[in-house]
């Protein structure tokens, strides 16, 4: 603790100019004071002034009023500082002395004589209020007041509480009268060292190092740190949690970088071809007759559509073609015959019927044969009747479609939902794809059916095939294989033309 006992001398009266021994001062009592402050004693005794002592210069002669003086010699009130916890009790001895010597340093003069002394014993609380008193004896009267106040930065009933106002890294506060801290605006905490963040700043996602600030933790953004940041590789997606990549409408793939509406956005197919949003590049062009190429940009030979009938040979010309007909045929496409039924033109048991008064004929073919002369065996699979990759097989007069897994129906046109039987374990999400069901596994599980629990760095073993990139950190304990074009599967192990970069999670 630290404080100051202050004594204000107000008036001293010694009308007769007498000393304590009854003698008179000549020419008058040139008066100075000695003050001794010590711990409380029921009976005041000589001995050290344990709380401090002080002397004044000569303040006047015989009777005088003592003016307040704040500096230099003769300072009033008198200051008795102490460096301990104020006990609340004290003993005070005030002695008035006459000196024949130096006004300013009368203590040092020989021949000083006691005029009078007073002793005060009692209790005194720390406070700003002065306690006023007056002591009389037969010859003198002393008016005075006193108090105990705390030194700068000390507070409390005993001046034992240290508080120094500050505004720096260690705290931002002022001191209350009792020494408790009063935080400056924008600061809080026991030592006022915690800033009060911007109102509404998210408690978990945000923090601050100074008032009214809101600094976001990794993965969060915005004024209040309540908006997430999408994954670093994300292209056309958003997030609801940090580092997610939820695709915008019309985009797909692990990083939302595949245009699901490529046909609409880019019109890649030329020469009147049909564009569909599928295939390894995100689109496929179906060309009109006479065109080829990835974008149907290449014109085919005019003969490519085999326009010449009845065995005629085709020759390309600048903007057209020419059919060279075999013997017995004529016309632009060798479609007219010079033969008649007499020439037995119908093969494979076909029946000949004369037309145009016998100048031409038509063949009626038996089952399984076709062509103008019944020369072709019917291939019932030429029209590609089997959908969804089914295999067409000729069976005598009919044909059947052998369907791929997941499809049924006469033409394999019906899709069987493999997900109906819930093949994915541990809460995996099932996707019906051409090759059968595929499971997207939750965090911590892998395998084609999410049956394997992961307990290690999933990418460490290099699980992805065919040049696929392995990712961890998208969700705990899982890896994701981002497949190159032309490969699918949880590890990109299957070379199948499924939609690219489906997020296969192992």
């Amino acid at each position: 603790g630290s404080g100051i006992f202050q004594l204000r001398l107000q008036e001293f009266v010694n009308q007769r100019g007498m000393l304590a021994n009854g003698q008179s001062c000549e020419p008058g009592c040139r008066t100075f004071f000695r003050i001794c402050l010590k711990h409380f004693q029921a009976t005041f005794s000589e001995g050290p002034c344990t709380f401090g002592n002080v002397s004044t210069p000569v303040l006047g002669t015989n009777s005088f009023v003592v003016r307040d003086k704040n500096s230099g010699s003769g300072r009033n009130p008198l200051q008795l500082p102490f460096n301990f916890t104020w006990p609340g009790t004290f003993s005070l001895n005030i002695q008035a002395w006459h000196t024949p010597g130096d006004d300013l340093r009368p203590e040092t003069s020989p021949g000083n004589s006691l005029i009078s002394q007073i002793i005060i014993q009692g209790s005194l609380a720390v406070g700003k209020i002065w306690r006023t008193d007056e002591q009389n004896d037969t010859l003198t009267r002393l008016s005075y007041s006193y108090r105990v106040i705390c030194s700068d930065n000390y507070y409390g009933e005993s001046c034992s509480r240290l508080c120094k106002k500050r505004d720096d890294h260690f705290g931002h506060y002022e001191c209350q009268p009792d020494g408790s801290l009063s935080c400056l605006p924008g600061w809080t905490g026991k030592y006022c060292d915690q800033p009060i963040c911007l109102s509404g700043c998210h408690e978990q996602n945000g923090y601050c190092s100074k008032p009214d600030e809101c600094i976001c933790r990794p993965g969060w953004q915005g004024r209040l740190c309540n908006e997430c940041i999408p994954h670093n590789g994300c292209r056309h997606g958003t997030c609801s949690i940090p580092w997610q990549c939820a695709c915008d409408e019309g985009w797909g793939g692990l990083f939302c970088d595949q245009d699901l509406n490529y046909c609409t956005h880019h019109s890649p197919c030329k020469n009147g071809s049909t564009c569909s949003n599928s295939g390894p590049k995100g689109y496929t062009c179906t060309c009109l007759p006479g065109y080829t190429g990835e974008h149907c940009e290449l014109g085919l030979s005019k003969c490519a559509s085999n326009p010449c009938r009845n065995g005629g040979s085709c020759k390309d010309q600048e903007n057209s073609y020419h059919c060279l007909c075999p013997p017995g045929y004529y016309g632009q496409h060798c479609e007219h015959s010079t033969l008649t039924c007499a020439d037995s033109p119908c093969f494979n048991g076909g029946s000949c019927r004369e037309r145009n008064q016998g100048s031409s004929y038509a063949c009626e073919c038996p089952p399984n044969f076709t062509g103008s002369n019944c020369e072709k065996k019917v291939d019932r699979c030429t029209s590609n009747p089997c959908a969804n990759g089914g295999q067409c097989q000729n069976r005598g007069p009919s044909r059947t479609c052998r369907c791929r897994p997941g499809f049924t129906g006469t033409h394999c046109e019906l899709h069987i939902s493999d997900c109906a039987r819930s093949p994915c374990a541990h809460g995996g999400t099932c996707h019906d794809l051409e090759n059968g069901p595929v499971c997207t596994c939750p965090a911590g599980f892998s395998g084609r059916r999410c049956e394997v629990r992961i307990t290690h760095d999933a990418c460490a073993s290099g699980p992805c095939f065919n040049g696929a990139t392995c990712y961890t950190g998208l969700s705990p304990n899982n890896f994701v294989c981002n497949c190159p074009y032309g490969f699918v599967g949880s590890r990109c192990e299957f070379p199948v033309g499924l939609p690219p970069s489906f997020p296969w999670v192992a």
Partner: antibody, heavy 118, light 107 residues
């Protein structure tokens, strides 16, 4: 393909102003926070400013606060840096980058040189 | 601000060598660290984020490790195109700060 193309750099006197632009393509610009990062000749990289995608909140390094302003126009897929009261120590190649102050800078532009000299 | 210190500031190596670059943070940044590669006259390119995650299209010969204050970038078998300057960056604390760079030169 993600592309960031800066423009607007050049020679300017101390105390002068310059406005840098960054044209973004290949990603949904409005979904992502953006930043400016600079590199003084022969020196390392230094983050300058960031703007959020959600509400346009801005942050600046202390040495440019009050002098530089980062802004964005989502309709034009563009990021801007208005630089006022330029100083010699602002001389650098300024890169437009996709990222925030608390995330990696995933994509960068080719940079534009700003020279502050009398 | 967090100080990021890279070492060495430069190093010479040959094609096929295994190379390690270290980065030390002045305080804990957890795993919020990225590595960038920069070639002369070009923009930096993100190699690794979150200490050990490879950015899209980055060859698997690059790897990262560490946590807290000490981190490493390793190139398992140097290729001719790997000679460049490498920077680490922390994004755990505001403001983000970069290391001073490590120049990888051909021996």
């Amino acid at each position: 393909e993600v592309q960031l193309v800066e423009s607007g750099g050049g020679l300017v006197q101390p105390g002068g102003s310059l406005r840098l632009s960054c044209a973004a393509s290949g990603f949904t610009f409005s979904n992502f926070p953006m930043a400016w990062v600079r590199q003084a000749p022969g020196k390392g990289l230094e983050w300058v400013a960031t703007i959020s995608s959600s509400d346009g909140t801005t942050y600046y390094r202390d040495s440019v606060k009050g002098r530089f302003t980062i802004s964005r126009d989502n309709a034009k897929n563009s990021l801007y840096l208005q630089m006022n009261s330029l100083r010699a120590e602002d001389t650098a190649v300024y890169y437009c980058a996709r990222g925030y102050y608390n995330s990696p800078f995933a994509y960068w532009g080719q940079g534009t040189l700003v020279t502050v000299s009398s | 601000d967090i100080q990021m210190t890279q070492s060495p500031s430069s190093l010479s190596a040959s094609v096929g060598d295994r190379v390690t670059i270290t980065c030390r943070a002045s305080e804990d940044i957890y795993s919020n660290l990225a590595w960038y590669q920069q070639k002369p006259g070009k923009a930096p390119k993100l190699l690794i984020f979150d200490t050990n995650n490879l950015a899209d299209g980055v060859p698997s010969r690059f790897s990262g490790s560490g946590s807290g204050t000490d981190f490493t970038l390793t190139i398992s078998s140097l290729q001719p195109e790997d000679f460049a300057t490498y920077y680490c960056q922390q994004y755990n604390n505001y403001p983000p700060t970069f290391g001073q760079g490590t120049k990888l030169e051909i021996k």
